[in-house]
């Protein structure tokens, strides 16, 4: 991974593009920290394992987060 101690935040660019929850392998929400002062959302896609940084402020991404948490709550007993 191209990472050095000087890299503070993971995302170089962020995407507003809606993501189909069915095409998601994993959704990571990285809270703000001493290294990166903002929340970062990283979607791992099933196709080729592509990772995409998402815009936490985007309406489409907020809807995605709701859909994913709803799906998780359905699955948990």
């Amino acid at each position: 991974v191209p990472l050095s101690r000087t890299v503070r935040c993971t995302c170089i660019s962020i995407s507003n593009q809606p993501v189909n929850p069915r095409s998601l392998e994993k959704l990571e929400i990285i809270p703000a920290s001493q290294f990166c002062p903002r929340v970062e959302i990283i979607a791992t896609m099933k196709k080729k394992g592509e990772k995409r940084c998402l815009n936490p402020e985007s309406k489409a991404i907020k809807n995605l987060l709701k859909a994913v948490s709803k799906e998780r709550s359905k699955r948990s007993p």
């Epitope: 191209p2 990472l3 962020i14 593009q17 002062p37």
Partner: antibody, heavy 124, light 109 residues
């Protein structure tokens, strides 16, 4: 459509300074990392600098460290390259380029939009 | 620092022929970090391939990328007149820096 327009190039004496600008349109500039890439006459491409979408990180090729500064003003949709202590070997076409949507340190989507470049000539 | 080497330096082919361009890295590169660009004289570069094998938006399917580790390939299945240009591979490496190869010129035989 997505467009980048560079300006600020010109002829400058060695040791002097120049500021390049790159104005973006047709996309949400504040969402994308941005790069400067240069091409010396008759030579290949050389990456110069990158800035994260929010300015949080900036990185440079070794040959310009301490002399060049990349910055951005998201309210003006503009990217800058401040070039100090210019040398003859800095003579090149300077392109600004957009980092692809969603790129991060774990996956790279390439430089997907480029300007037409602005020419910097150092020397007489 | 990873160095990229491209071969051949020049490839002389006729329209309709297949072009195979090679990009070799001095150390292993994750395919997630490898891109290819096309540049025509007097024009800015254009992104063709990212992630070693994914075509960028609007790129015709005659362009394909493959490879892993230290060896990557750009293939143009049937050369069109507009494909004669210089092709650069590029990698995103630690620090982070973004290194270009020296380029391969594809010219008309």
């Amino acid at each position: 459509q997505m467009q980048l327009v560079e300006s600020g190039g010109g002829v400058v004496q060695p040791g002097r300074s120049l500021r390049l600008s790159c104005t973006a349109s047709g996309f949400t500039f504040s969402n994308n990392g941005m790069h400067w890439v240069r091409q010396a006459p008759g030579k290949g491409l050389e990456w110069v600098a990158v800035i994260w979408f929010d300015g949080m990180n900036k990185f440079y090729v070794d040959s310009v460290k301490g002399r060049f500064t990349i910055s951005r003003d998201n309210s003006k949709n503009t990217l800058y390259l401040e070039m100090n202590s210019l040398r003859a070997e800095d003579t090149a076409i300077y392109y600004c380029a957009r980092e692809g949507d969603g790129s991060g340190i774990y996956y790279y989507y390439g430089m997907d939009v480029w300007g037409q470049g602005t020419t910097v000539t150092v020397g007489g | 620092e990873i160095v990229l080497t491209q071969s051949p330096g020049t490839l002389s082919l006729s329209p309709g022929e297949r072009a195979t361009l090679s990009c070799r890295a001095s150390q292993s590169v994750s395919s997630s970090y490898l891109a290819w660009y096309q540049q025509k004289p007097g024009q800015a570069p254009r992104l063709l391939i990212y992630g070693a094998s994914s075509r960028a938006t609007g790129i015709p399917d005659r362009f394909s990328g493959s490879g892993s580790g230290t060896d990557f390939t750009l293939t143009i299945s049937r050369l069109e007149p507009e494909d004669f240009a210089v092709y650069y591979c590029q990698q995103y490496g630690s620090s982070p820096i973004f290194t270009f190869g020296p380029g391969t010129k594809v010219d008309i035989k």
